[in-house]
C-alpha cells in the first residue's frame, strides 16, 4: 500500500575537522520510494557537485573534504507524492585547529611611540591568543594589551620592551605558535653630559667632554665657531650604549664649541646639540672692525623679541653666524627658565638684542649696541637678584655654563642714549606701556642707581616670549 514518507533518523548536529569527511544520514520509510533532496542554508545542493557524495538513494550526504566555509544548516526533504513532503535539519559545525593567518613581523620603533605586533588567527572554537617575550609569558600592564584581534599593542614603548616576541593561538583542538620576531626600540640621540665652558690663559690645554646616548649609539662631532674642528685631538669610547667624546684643545683664541650627537632612524636623523665657550682671560680681539653682514632674523628663539622689519648683524668670525649666534641665545635662553617671571622677559629681550644686534643702516654693516640704560634696567631692576647671583658664581668659578661670557653684555661698556640717541638700540619690551599705566613694577626699597628710560613694565602681557628652540 502507498505510504507517505517518514524520516526515521532525524538529522543531528555533526562536528567535523577541516579537510576531514562529514556525513549526514536521513533514513526514510515510504512507499513508493521517495525522492530525497538536500539543501545547505536553504540552497539546493546539486547532485553533480563534486564536493559532495549522495548515496543510498539520497539518504546519505557526505562532504568529502570539509572546508571552514561548509558551516551551516543542512536539511533533507523526502517526497513520494503520497501525503506531504517531510524535512529534517541538522547543523554542521566545522571545527578548526588554531591557525595564525597574519603573523607578527619584526618592528623597529622609536621610544615613546606606540607599537602594534599583529597576530590574526582562525579556528573553531575561537582561539585565545597570548604572547611570549623571550622565554616567559607576557604579562599585560597599563602599557601592554592584547587586542580583540590578537595583536599586541604597546603604548609609550620603552627600551626595556625590546626583545623577541611570539604569539600563541590556543583552542580545544590544539595550539599554534608564530615565528619569533624582534621588537627593536630606537632612541633619539640625547646628550647626557654637556661640555663645560672654560675661561683659561692663552696657550693652555683644555679638554671638553661630551657624553651622549641613543639607540643606535650616536656619533659625536665637534664644531668650532660653526666649522668642523680643525685642530685638537678627539678620543672616543662607547660603553653600554653611551658614547663619551673628549676634545683636547690648545687654546690660542676664544671660541664657541658645539658637541653634536646624531643617530639614524630609517631615513631620518635625530640630533642633539650642546655648546660651551672657551674664553681667554684678559683676551682682547686684535680687530677694531666689526666683521659681518646684515640679514633678516630667521631663527626661532628670538622670533617674538626682535623687531620684525629690522636687519640683524651676523658676525662672520663664525663660519656659520646664524647657527652659532642662534646656539648662543638658545643655550643662554635655557638657563633663563629658572629665573623669576619679572626677570625672564627682560633678560630674554636683553639677550636677543645683544647677540642679534640691530644693524646700523649706514654704508658699512655695523651692529648697534644696546643703550646702557636698558642694560642697567635689566641688571639693577628686573633681574637684580639673579644678576647678583650670577656674578657671585662667576667670581667663585661655580658658573657651570659660562655662556654669559659671550651672551650677556657689560652694561658699563655700552653707550648711553644721552650721548647719541641713534648710536644705541632701545629695548621696546622694557618701555613704559603708555596704554596701560598699571604696568609699573612694584618698586623695591633699594632704589636702583640707574636712569631708566620711562619705567619698565612688569606685566607679562607687555613682553614677548618666544617658544623654546628645538634642537632635534
Amino acid at each position: 500500500l502507498p505510504k507517505a514518507p517518514v524520516i526515521t533518523t532525524p538529522l543531528e548536529t555533526v562536528d567535523a575537522l577541516v579537510e576531514e569527511v562529514a556525513t549526514f544520514m536521513c533514513a526514510v520509510e515510504s512507499y513508493p520510494q521517495p525522492e530525497i533532496s538536500w539543501t545547505r542554508n536553504k540552497i539546493l545542493i546539486k547532485l553533480f557537485d563534486t564536493r559532495y557524495s549522495i548515496r543510498e538513494n539520497g539518504q546519505l550526504l557526505t562532504i568529502l573534504s570539509v572546508e571552514d566555509s561548509d558551516d551551516g544548516i543542512y536539511c533533507c526533504t523526502a517526497n513520494n507524492g503520497v501525503g506531504g513532503a517531510v524535512e529534517s535539519c541538522g547543523a554542521l559545525q566545522v571545527k578548526m585547529k588554531p591557525k595564525i593567518t597574519r603573523p607578527p613581523i619584526n618592528v623597529k620603533i622609536i621610544e615613546g611611540l606606540k607599537a602594534v605586533l599583529p597576530c590574526t588567527t582562525m579556528g573553531n572554537p575561537k582561539p585565545s591568543v597570548s604572547w611570549i617575550k623571550g622565554d616567559s609569558p607576557l604579562r599585560e600592564n597599563s602599557r601592554t594589551a592584547v587586542l580583540e584581534s590578537g595583536s599586541l599593542r604597546i603604548h609609550n614603548v620603552q627600551k626595556e620592551d625590546a626583545g623577541q616576541y611570539r604569539c600563541v593561538a590556543k583552542n580545544s583542538l590544539g595550539t599554534a605558535y608564530s615565528k619569533v620576531v624582534k621588537l627593536e626600540v630606537e632612541v633619539f640621540a640625547r646628550i647626557l653630559r654637556a661640555p663645560e665652558s672654560h675661561n683659561v690663559t692663552f696657550g693652555s690645554f683644555v679638554t671638553l667632554h661630551c657624553t651622549a646616548t641613543g639607540i643606535p649609539v650616536p656619533t659625536i662631532t665637534w664644531i668650532e665657531n660653526g666649522n668642523a674642528v680643525s685642530s685638537g685631538s678627539i678620543q672616543e669610547s662607547v660603553k653600554d650604549r653611551v658614547i663619551d667624546s673628549r676634545l683636547q684643545l690648545f687654546i690660542t683664541k676664544p671660541g664657541l664649541y658645539t658637541c653634536i650627537a646624531t643617530n639614524k632612524h630609517g631615513e631620518k636623523f635625530s640630533t642633539a646639540k650642546a655648546a660651551a665657550t672657551v674664553s681667554i682671560a684678559e683676551w682682547s680681539k686684535p680687530q677694531k672692525d666689526n666683521k659681518g653682514y646684515c640679514a633678516q632674523y630667521r631663527g626661532e628663539v628670538c622670533n617674538a623679541v626682535l623687531a620684525k622689519d629690522a636687519l640683524v648683524f651676523l658676525n662672520t668670525s663664525y663660519a656659520d653666524p646664524e647657527e652659532a649666534q642662534e646656539l648662543l641665545v638658545h643655550t643662554a635662553w635655557n638657563e633663563l627658565k629658572v629665573v623669576s617671571p619679572l626677570c625672564r622677559p627682560a633678560a630674554e629681550a636683553l639677550l636677543c638684542n645683544h647677540v642679534f644686534q640691530e644693524c646700523s643702516p649706514g654704508v658699512v654693516p655695523t651692529p648697534i649696541p644696546i643703550c646702557r640704560e636698558y642694560c642697567l634696567a635689566v641688571k639693577e631692576l628686573f633681574c637684580a637678584k639673579e644678576w647678583l647671583a650670577m656674578e657671585e658664581k662667576t667670581h667663585r668659578g661655580l658658573y657651570r655654563s659660562e655662556m654669559h661670557l659671550l651672551s650677556v653684555p657689560e652694561c658699563s661698556k655700552l653707550p648711553s642714549m644721552h650721548w647719541d640717541p641713534t648710536a644705541c638700540a632701545r629695548l621696546p619690551h622694557l618701555d613704559y606701556n603708555k596704554e596701560n599705566p598699571k604696568t609699573f613694577p612694584p618698586m623695591t626699597s633699594s632704589k636702583p642707581s640707574v636712569d631708566i628710560p620711562n619705567l619698565p613694565s612688569s606685566s607679562s602681557s607687555s613682553f614677548s616670549v618666544s617658544p623654546t628652540y628645538s634642537m632635534t
Epitope: 686684535p286 680687530q287 677694531k288 672692525d289 666683521k291 659681518g292 653682514y293 646684515c294 640679514a295 636687519l311 662672520t316 644693524c359 646700523s360 643702516p361 649706514g362 654704508v363 658699512v364 654693516p365
Partner: antibody, heavy 121, light 107 residues
C-alpha cells in the same frame, strides 16, 4: 631687482668739472641698509672707488680725490650725481655707479654698465 | 690709505684649482669681497664677507680670509672663468679699497 644707469657727457675739457648722473630704478636711494657709490676704471687699469652717498644723504670720499669730488642726490628723481672738478687727462676712465648693500657686507651687488668719459681738449 | 696687493696674473689648467690672493695689513679683520670682470662688461660680485656666495654664483667659487691674506679659490676652473678678479674691502673710516686686479687665464 634694482637697476642703475649712468649718464653724462662723454667728452670733458681739462680743468672743467665732470658731472655724471646715476638713475636708480626698482628701489629707493633713501632705503635703509643701502648706499650708492661711484667707481671708475682708467683704460687698461683697475677699479678705483671715488665716493659714496648713504641712505640718509651723508657722503664719504676717497682720500686721494676728496678735494675735487662731490656727490649729491635728488630724491624726487631717485638719482645721485658725481661732480669731479679740475679734471685732467688722467681722469679719463669708464665711470660706474653701484649699489652697496649691508645684506652682502657692503659689497657692490648692482652695477651700471658704465659710461666712458674722455678728458681731452 | 689702505693698500691691497694682488698678483697681476694667474694661470690654471682647465678643471684644475686656481687660487687668487689679496694681501693687506690685517685684512682678516675686515670683510673681503671679490668681483669678476670680463672685457667690456661691468664687474659682478662673486663673493662677499670673505666666503659667501650670492645666488647664481657657481659652487666652485669659494673664499677664505685670515691674517694678512684673503684668498679666492676656483675649484675645477672652467673656460668661462677667464676674467679679471678684484678684491675689495671697506676700512674703518668708510673708505672702499680695491686690489689692483688679477687676470686669470684658463689653459
Amino acid at each position: 631687482q634694482v637697476q642703475v644707469q649712468e649718464s653724462g657727457p662723454g667728452l670733458v675739457k681739462p680743468s672743467q668739472t665732470l658731472s655724471l648722473t646715476c638713475t636708480v630704478s626698482g628701489g629707493s636711494i633713501t632705503a635703509r641698509y643701502y648706499s650708492w657709490s661711484w667707481i671708475r676704471q682708467p683704460p687698461g687699469k683697475g677699479l678705483e672707488w671715488m665716493g659714496v652717498i648713504a641712505y640718509d644723504g651723508s657722503t664719504y670720499y676717497s682720500p686721494s680725490l676728496k678735494s675735487r669730488t662731490s656727490i649729491s642726490r635728488d630724491t624726487s628723481k631717485n638719482q645721485f650725481s658725481l661732480h669731479l672738478s679740475s679734471v685732467t687727462p688722467d681722469d679719463t676712465a669708464v665711470y660706474y655707479c653701484a649699489r652697496g648693500s649691508s645684506r652682502v657686507a657692503a659689497a657692490f651687488d648692482s652695477w651700471g654698465q658704465g659710461t666712458q668719459v674722455t678728458v681731452s681738449s | 690709505s689702505y693698500e691691497l696687493t694682488q698678483s697681476p696674473s694667474v694661470s690654471v689648467a682647465l678643471r684644475q684649482t686656481a687660487k687668487i690672493t689679496c694681501g693687506g695689513d690685517n685684512i682678516g679683520s675686515k670683510n673681503a669681497q671679490w668681483y669678476q670682470q670680463k672685457p667690456g662688461q661691468a664687474p659682478v660680485m662673486v663673493l662677499y664677507a670673505d666666503s659667501r656666495r650670492p645666488s647664481g654664483i657657481p659652487e666652485r667659487f669659494s673664499g677664505s680670509n685670515s691674517g694678512n691674506t684673503a684668498t679666492l679659490t676656483i675649484s675645477g676652473a672652467q673656460a668661462e672663468d677667464e676674467a679679471d678678479y678684484y678684491c675689495h674691502v671697506w676700512d674703518s673710516s668708510t673708505n672702499a679699497w680695491f686690489g689692483g686686479g688679477t687676470h686669470l687665464t684658463v689653459l
